[in-house]
Interface confidence: low
């Protein structure tokens, strides 16, 4: 249909403007649109000036590209004549309404295909797909290689020239190591290469008292160790020991008026017994602060354990479970209150219901047919447990709950009896005092560890097992073991540790297999009031890491051997420890100090909740972290 239209237009042009002269209006009737008419008519007048000598000035045939008026006029509507495209770069030219479209050859761009594409800078094909050097050329590009490499047949990748194979005796009895573009004569650690004899000579490091605390000698080397669990670390000289110093002081101020609910990893923090007149009803008022999402705030029961009430937190909301001779109920309601703010909570037994209020606003009203606890002999006897419940209760709950709750309460008033007697108990016991200010996170005080049982086997993967670790850390000391996998034979097949860096005010992260550092991330400023995000991915073939500064896949000659050691351990059973090491020999790892600071850990996509640990040191805080100590003008 388009070609028929073009032929019609061409015929009209012939009749109207070549066989006869046409004015602009007549030309408009030929083209039937303004852009083409406005483009055509001035050029038509130029053709007339050139060929219609009788009408205009004499034609200068010598300067005209066309032999006659017909050719000159017929060429006007063709935007591709004369060719507007760059001859080197164009593939075809398409005529349009008072416009043209140049289709470019590969390697060219621009309206007229006048610009060479720099394939070497193409973001979608980095470095033009060349493994080493990319050289851009007009309309094309080619790859080349650095010294010591040769180009492969695919013309993109470079292969290293193996000098060690070309000259087998180049290093004598030492090992010739081919490196990209060069070679090296290598000796095992603890030996040095002798150029004259072309051999490796042993270095005897441990013949003198090299180490301050403990020296372990082995063929080709030695290692000094310090007792990290007593707060020592190896000094920069790798021989003497120094105290692990605080790099980020924390505000560890506590108040005895604030009761810490997570004093015990397993067990009740406070137990009270009330004997009140039979007209009394259950009542509890307190201010409550936590970042924890699940756990027991308080549990109350009758003396004979026939009736009980549980006030807990689940999903950050208040949950009430109750059971007595009349009813068995579970209710959750109100807003999420694990926001780290002080929330006023009251639970009051009314005549026909139990009212739960947050900030004096009713959030739940639980109907009950009769009294919650039945009086006996004119007395209402009630036992109240803070932050836990007796062991036997666990199986009786309507819905199971993890009782551990990292939180604080203050301004409590139980059974309308005020705080009498309780403050006196708490005042004497430092462990029951809560920190004045806390932030979200988990806190490791540098004195203990948490243990988890995690199955790293991935049956759906060819790798067989994998360890994907994400750490969000805010250390307070620059040295300590953050995460360790420990085998049954007291070896540590994998550990992630922090050490103070040789460069001032920065830290290195060590990845180790047994007592060998397989990778060191150097000079990161981790001791700041901002959290740092670290990621590690390990399987039997690869080790990848991501830090605030870089993402990389680690590969070095010894790595596969170390990963094989790790692979063997992972096929047996390993225990996962956070914050330090259990009782393993000093020489089991490069670092043995406890980690001190805030840390949140995600392993294989699961955020580890310290409340779910197999065991945890009581001083580790599962869901609260002390604030950074701010210097005031007076201090």
């Amino acid at each position: 249909a388009n070609s028929l239209l073009e032929e019609t237009k061409q015929g009209n042009l012939e009749r109207e403007c070549i066989e006869e002269l046409c004015n602009k209006e007549e030309a408009r009737e030929v083209f039937e649109n303004d852009p083409e008419t406005d483009y055509f008519y001035p050029k038509y007048l130029v053709c007339l000036r050139s060929f219609q000598t009788g009408l205009f000035t004499a034609a200068r045939q010598s300067t005209n590209a066309y032999p006659d008026l017909r050719s000159c006029v017929n060429a006007i509507p063709d935007q591709c004549s004369p060719l507007p495209c760059n001859e080197d770069g164009y593939m075809s030219c398409k005529d349009g309404k008072a416009s043209f479209t140049c289709t470019c050859k590969p390697g060219w761009q621009g309206e007229k295909c006048e610009f060479d594409i720099n394939e070497c800078k193409d973001p979608s094909n980095i470095n033009g797909g060349c493994s080493q050097i990319c050289d851009n050329t007009p309309g094309s590009y080619h790859c080349s290689c650095k010294n010591g490499f040769v180009m492969l047949s695919n013309k993109k990748d470079c292969k290293d020239v193996d000098e060690c194979s070309l000259k087998p005796s180049i290093c004598g009895t030492a090992v010739c190591k081919n490196i990209p573009g060069d070679f090296e004569c290598e000796c095992p650690e603890g030996y040095r290469y002798n150029l004259k004899s072309k051999s490796c000579e042993d270095i005897d490091e441990c013949s003198e008292n090299m180490c301050a605390q403990l020296c372990v000698n082995y063929p080709g080397g030695y290692t000094c160790y310090c007792d990290g669990k007593k707060g020592f670390k190896l000094a920069q000289d790798q021989k003497s020991c120094e105290v692990v110093s605080v790099c980020l002081p924390l505000n560890l101020d506590t108040k005895y008026e604030l009761l810490y609910l997570a004093e015990q990893f397993a067990g009740v923090v406070l137990y009270l017994k009330f004997r009140l007149p039979e007209i009394s009803r259950f009542s509890a008022e307190f201010d409550f602060r936590t970042y924890d999402s699940e756990g027991v705030i308080l549990y109350a029961e009758s003396i004979d354990h026939s009736a009980w009430l549980l006030i807990a937190l689940r999903g950050g909301k208040i949950e009430v479970q109750l059971k007595n001779e009349h009813t068995s109920k579970i209710t959750t309601g109100g807003d999420v209150i694990n926001n780290g703010l002080w929330n006023m909570v009251s639970v009051e037994e009314l005549e026909h219901s139990i009212s739960i209020k947050i900030a004096k606003e009713a959030v739940m009203d639980i109907n009950k047919p009769g009294p919650l606890f039945k009086p006996e002999n004119g007395l209402l006897e009630t036992k109240v447990y803070f932050a836990g419940f007796p062991r036997k209760v666990e199986s009786e709950l309507i819905k199971p709950i993890n009782p551990r709750l990292d939180g604080c309460i203050r301004s409590w008033n139980l059974m309308k009896q005020g705080a009498s007697g309780i403050k006196e108990i708490i005042q004497e016991k430092q462990n029951k005092h809560c920190l004045v200010t806390v932030e979200k996170g988990s806190y490791y005080p540098g004195s203990g560890i948490a243990q988890f049982h995690i199955d790293y086997n991935n049956v759906s993967s060819a790798e067989g097992w994998h360890v994907n670790v994400t750490l969000n850390i805010r250390p307070s000391t620059g040295t300590g073991v953050m995460l360790a996998l420990v085998s049954g034979n007291n070896t540590v097949p994998f550990a992630v540790s922090l050490v103070d860096s040789t460069s001032e005010k920065s830290q290195d992260i060590l990845l180790s297999v047994e007592n060998t550092v397989i990778y060191r991330i150097q000079a990161l400023s981790l001791c700041s009031d901002q959290q740092s995000h670290l990621e590690f991915r390990v399987n039997r073939n690869n080790l990848e890491l991501s830090t605030p500064l870089k993402i990389e896949t680690i590969s070095h000659e010894d790595l596969q051997r170390q990963l094989a050691v790790l692979d063997k351990a992972m096929k047996a059973k390993v225990a996962t420890y956070l914050g330090g090491l259990p009782d393993v020999p000093f020489s089991a790892t490069p670092v043995n100090a406890f980690y001190n600071g805030c840390m949140e850990v995600n392993i294989n996509g699961v955020q580890l909740d310290l409340d779910e640990a197999i065991s945890k040191h009581n001083d580790i805080r599962a869901h609260s972290c002390p604030s950074v100590w701010k210097k005031t003008k007076n201090s």
Epitope: R314, G315, K317, T332, G333, K399, P400
Partner: antibody, heavy 122, light 107 residues
């Protein structure tokens, strides 16, 4: 008695879309998480998707991730399931189900609608 | 995901007799297990939750037991209205999963 009434099912060609609705009544709709569960002809029950009481959190079975979208309008007491790029294997009766617990966590389903049949076929 | 396996697939019982249905989880679901009953052409109906708690209006002849990975639904004396398909459902972790069902038929 809680009432859940599904609608929007029907015959659709492979690659097509449907939007299911579930009208809820006789309970405090905005306090409960809701789910969609489906049952292919002659087969068992398969959980498809869930949405929190406020609608801020959504969960999907791997088989429908990226293809189905669950949503709710608490002002209209209505639950929705937008199904795109439908395949023959999505042919099933789709039930909407009420979460037993109120508040922000998820449990079993204490009430089910009568279901609406979705047939994906040429 | 947690795989729920029900056995037997079909159970033929005389009216008035006891029926015992089994449900096994591929990993622990604690007590977070529900049982649903579905009659032909009808929507499912909740029977038990928390492994052993009867839902509102469910007769005492239905009882549940078990925790962790092994669960049992028992119907002490089968009535004509009990012949249906029974499904177990775990609600311990995403995605929620159902067993393949046990069809209880008249012998």
């Amino acid at each position: 008695e809680v009432q859940l009434l599904e609608s929007g099912g029907g015959l659709v060609q492979p690659g097509g879309s449907l939007r299911l609705s579930c009208a809820a009544s006789r309970f405090s709709f905005s306090s409960y998480a809701m789910s969609w569960v489906r049952q292919a002809p002659g087969k068992g029950l398969e959980w498809v998707s869930a949405i929190s009481d406020s609608g801020s959190n959504t969960y999907y079975a791997d088989s429908v991730k990226g293809l189905f979208t669950i949503s709710r309008d608490n002002s209209k007491n209505t639950l929705y399931l937008q199904m795109n790029s439908l395949r023959a294997e999505d042919t099933a009766v789709y039930y909407c189900a009420k979460n037993y617990e109120s508040g922000g966590y998820y449990t079993f389903f204490d009430y089910w609608g009568q279901g609406t049949l979705v047939t994906v076929s040429t | 995901e947690i795989v729920m396996t029900q056995s037997p697939a079909t159970l033929s019982v005389f009216p008035g007799e006891r029926a015992t249905l089994s449900c096994r989880a591929s990993q622990s679901v604690r007590s977070n297990l529900a049982w649903h009953q579905q009659k032909l052409g009808q929507a499912p109906r909740l029977l038990l939750y928390g492994a052993s708690t009867r839902a509102t209006g469910i007769p005492a002849r239905f009882s549940g037991s078990g925790s962790g990975t092994e669960f049992t639904l028992a119907i002490s004396s089968l009535q004509s209205e009990d012949f249906a398909v029974y499904y177990c459902q775990q609600y311990n972790s995403w995605p929620f999963t159902f067993g393949g069902g046990t069809k209880v038929g008249i012998k």
